[in-house]
């Protein structure tokens, strides 16, 4: 297993509709053709997998149908979008990249993107 550098923004603020997007960029030392991207959420020292996708270079990322993630790839960059976020989902979202094939296998883990989610205020009742 060889190490690889992964960069991602430090902070992202989710939209009022609970959507957060960020770029995960990896410094590919090899000529990888198949890449696996995993988003991990770290909160209260607990790490859970949010979503994962394997894609072929030059092709689109395909997450599972019920995944809250979508994404596109361009070269060594992956544009990730996480939907359906609520205030309780605020936390550190870590991008993990694996160059799966061909050998050698490379693993890179970013420092994480702190995503802040603020639930929208309910609209006040109107007398009109």
């Amino acid at each position: 297993c060889k190490a690889m550098h992964v960069a991602q923004p430090a902070v992202v603020l989710a939209s009022s509709r609970g959507i957060a997007s960020f770029v995960c960029e990896y410094a590919s030392p090899g000529k990888a053709t198949e890449v696996r991207v995993t988003v991990l959420r770290q909160a209260d020292s607990q790490v859970t997998e949010v979503c994962a996708a394997t894609y072929m270079m030059g092709n689109e990322l395909t997450f599972l149908d019920d995944s809250i993630c979508t994404g596109t790839s361009s070269g060594n960059q992956v544009n990730l979008t996480i939907q359906g976020l609520r205030a309780m989902d605020t936390g550190l979202y870590i991008c993990k990249v694996e160059l799966m094939y061909p050998p050698p296998y490379y693993l890179g883990i970013g420092n994480g993107t702190q995503i802040y989610v603020i639930d929208p205020e309910p609209c006040p009742d109107s007398d009109f």
Partner: antibody
Framework: EVQLLESGGGLVQPGGSLRLSCAAS????????MSWVRQAPGKGLEWVSG????????HYADSVKGRFTISRDNSKNTLYLQMNSLRAEDTAVYYC?????????????WGQGTLVTVSS | QSVLTQPPSASGTPGQRVTISCTGS?????????VHWYQQLPGTAPKLLIY???KRPSGVPDRFSGSKSGTSASLAISGLRSEDEADYYC???????????FGGGTKLTVL
């Protein structure tokens, strides 16, 4: 338990065809590249073919290029090797091999092997 | 003719230290690809002995060690035991062949 189980070997005449299968269990099959490795009687190991986890990337040894086809069905956790235009020198025990998480470039999971005999 | 070159045989007495070499080229070992070693006991499937040049999978005794330098690698077995009698193979990915290459194998005899 992580396991690979090959099947489909047997006796076939030169020029004939055979399809080997390798059933995988105990790990996330679709995440890992798989390979076929063969061993002729009394000889050493020879890598035959490899396929990426998605099946999108495939490589063959020069000795089988154009005759053998590797494929996988991730919904069935099964790896295949379609062998056509078989020759006497293809006689060997065929192993499927892969790696578990953390050992991504070394085959630490092997099947028991299936014997292919090409003879008239 | 194998792409990786190993001595066909090696031998030693119990307790001795034995070394098996594996020589490659600039498209495999010399290209920076890791070397892995497999042990094959008679009539059984190969077993991973050393991976990533010098790492041991769990369950493999520390009598087995590996090293790599330039275009070659070696496997050392210290405190030789009768159960070490087997065939040993080195392997690495080859850039120009786009595939795995194995050494021809070394038959180790414990005298």
């Amino acid at each position: 338990e992580v396991q690979l189980l090959e099947s489909g070997g047997g006796l076939v005449q030169p020029g004939g065809s055979l399809r080997l299968s390798c059933a995988a269990s105990g790990f996330t099959f679709s995440s890992y590249a798989m390979s076929w490795v063969r061993q002729a009687p009394g000889k050493g190991l020879e890598w035959v073919s490899g396929i990426s986890g998605s099946g999108g990337y495939i490589h063959y040894a020069d000795s089988v290029k154009g005759r053998f086809t590797i494929s996988r069905d991730n919904s069935k956790n099964t790896l295949y090797l379609q062998m056509n235009s078989l020759r006497a020198e293809d006689t060997a025990v065929y192993y499927c091999a892969t790696y578990s998480s953390g050992l991504h470039d070394a085959f630490d999971i092997w099947g028991q092997g299936t014997l292919v005999t090409v003879s008239s | 003719q194998s792409v990786l070159t190993q001595p066909p045989s090696a031998s030693g007495t119990p307790g001795q230290r034995v070394t098996i070499s594996c020589t490659g080229s600039s498209s495999n070992i010399g290209a920076g690809y890791d070397v892995h070693w497999y042990q094959q006991l008679p009539g059984t499937a190969p077993k991973l002995l050393i991976y990533d040049n010098n790492k041991r999978p769990s369950g493999v005794p520390d009598r087995f060690s590996g090293s790599k330098s330039g275009t070659s690698a070696s496997l050392a077995i210290s405190g030789l035991r009768s159960e070490d009698e087997a065939d040993y193979y080195c392997a690495a990915w080859d850039d120009s062949l786009n595939g795995w290459v194995f050494g021809g194998g070394t038959k180790l005899t414990v005298l």
